[in-house]
């Protein structure tokens, strides 16, 4: 069998939201990932599983399954959400994303996303880790270049 | 109902100190910002401080850096402003207001305090 | 500090007719994020100045949509569509691109 290729593209939108009366912070993070298929033969992906971590505590986890079958020498992107909730013991951090005084309140976000792909009954897990920079002060849509951009780290090989 | 009360207005001499209070109801004190804004006697504004909503940042213009000092009590939903080393051009009408993280504005305002420095 | 202009009293206008009244920044408000960082209150006679745009061009929650508010980075309109008597006032606009800055306001005549 030929590889199977997974590329943690980028954030591509971050949608916030705030809790005044819980000092809390909620983003919605979606992310965009391509995944090659080299082989000769169809491939299932069979789940995507993403955390996101902030300051080395996980802030958010999603899991995606039964997502699409990817054909022989194709690839896909897919797109998924990651629904974090910055709170309690790193509520001071809702000082720093509501201040007005700065425009772009970025903090550092470790992505993590684990795909699960299946063929002939044989399954394969395929990891990447990234940081990126996202906004926790407003709305915002990214150029998947500038996603690129704002990486601090590459995804492990 | 956001109601923002000003209260700590005197009149006080050149070099004096002075401490304003502010009020606060009708929202959750303790998510929002807060920022001090004077109007001098000739009616223009100027924004004068800001505090971050847990205490953690203050921000100041050069005009009042080193001399004021905003603070706030969560527990008694209460902003202070603390004028020390006070000027003849610090005589104004000082508001303070709340501050907006959706819409970045300064949304609600006080009915202000009244300061005059003077000899 | 970025310097905010604005005439000191606008043309006369009747009620019912539309009134605009202009601001000018000494640098452009528009930052790399899309936002520029520009407002618009009101200061009625006696009372403290009230929230009328936000960002340019939004309104404020329980302002009339006869206000409305356009400009490029550096040149505002602020446009009363229909003047009513309770419009007259001080308008300022201010900018916190960089820390709060205000105009020094211009007041509505009434003719």
């Known amino acids: 069998p030929r590889s199977i290729e997974v590329k943690y593209i980028g954030v591509k939108s971050a949608y916030v939201s705030y809790d005044a009366e819980k000092r809390t912070i909620y983003l919605n993070i979606t992310n965009t990932l391509n995944i090659t298929n080299n082989n000769y033969y169809s491939v299932e992906v069979e789940n995507i599983t993403a955390q996101v971590q902030f300051s080395k505590t996980v802030i958010g986890k999603a899991r995606l399954n039964n997502i699409t079958n990817i054909g022989p020498l194709d690839m896909k992107q897919i797109d998924y959400t990651v629904p974090t909730v910055i709170a309690e013991e790193m509520s001071y951090m809702y000082d720093f994303c509501t201040l007005l005084s700065i425009k772009v309140h970025n903090i550092v976000l470790m992505m993590q996303v684990t795909v699960t792909t299946a063929y002939f009954g044989h399954s394969e897990q395929i990891s990447q880790e990234r940081y990126q920079y996202v906004d926790c002060g407003r709305n915002t849509t990214y150029q998947l270049a500038q996603s690129e951009y704002l990486n601090v780290l590459q995804p492990q090989q | 109902e956001v109601q923002l009360v000003e209260s700590g207005g005197d009149l006080v001499k050149p070099g004096g100190s002075l401490r304003l209070s502010c009020a606060a109801s009708?929202?959750?004190?303790?998510?929002?910002?807060m920022s001090w804004i004077r109007q001098t006697p000739d009616k223009r504004l100027e924004w004068v401080a800001t505090i971050s909503s847990g205490g953690r940042y203050t921000v100041y213009p050069d005009s009042v850096k080193g001399r004021f000092t905003m603070s706030r009590d969560n527990v008694k939903n209460t902003l202070y402003l603390q004028m020390s080393s006070l000027k003849s051009e610090d005589t104004a009408l000082y508001y303070c207001?709340?501050?907006?993280?959706?819409?970045?504005?300064?949304?609600?305002w006080g009915l202000g305090t009244s300061v005059t420095v003077s000899a | 500090d970025i310097v905010m202009t604005q005439a000191a009293f606008s043309n006369p206008v009747t009620l019912g007719t539309s009134a605009s009244i202009s601001c000018r920044s000494s640098k452009s408000l528009l930052h790399s994020n899309g936002i520029t960082y520009l407002f618009w209150y009101l200061q009625k006679p006696g009372q403290s100045p009230q929230l009328l745009i936000y960002?340019?061009?939004n309104l404020a929650s329980g302002v009339p949509d006869r206000f409305s508010s356009s400009g490029s980075g550096t040149d505002f309109t602020l446009r009363i569509s229909r003047v009513e008597a309770e419009d007259v006032g001080v308008y300022y606009c201010a900018q916190n691109l960089e820390l709060w800055t205000f105009g020094g306001g211009t007041k509505l005549e009434i003719k």
């Open positions: 960002q340019m061009s």
């Open positions: 207001a709340r501050d907006n993280f959706y819409s970045y504005a300064m949304d609600y």
């Open positions: 009708g929202f959750t004190f303790s998510g929002y910002g």
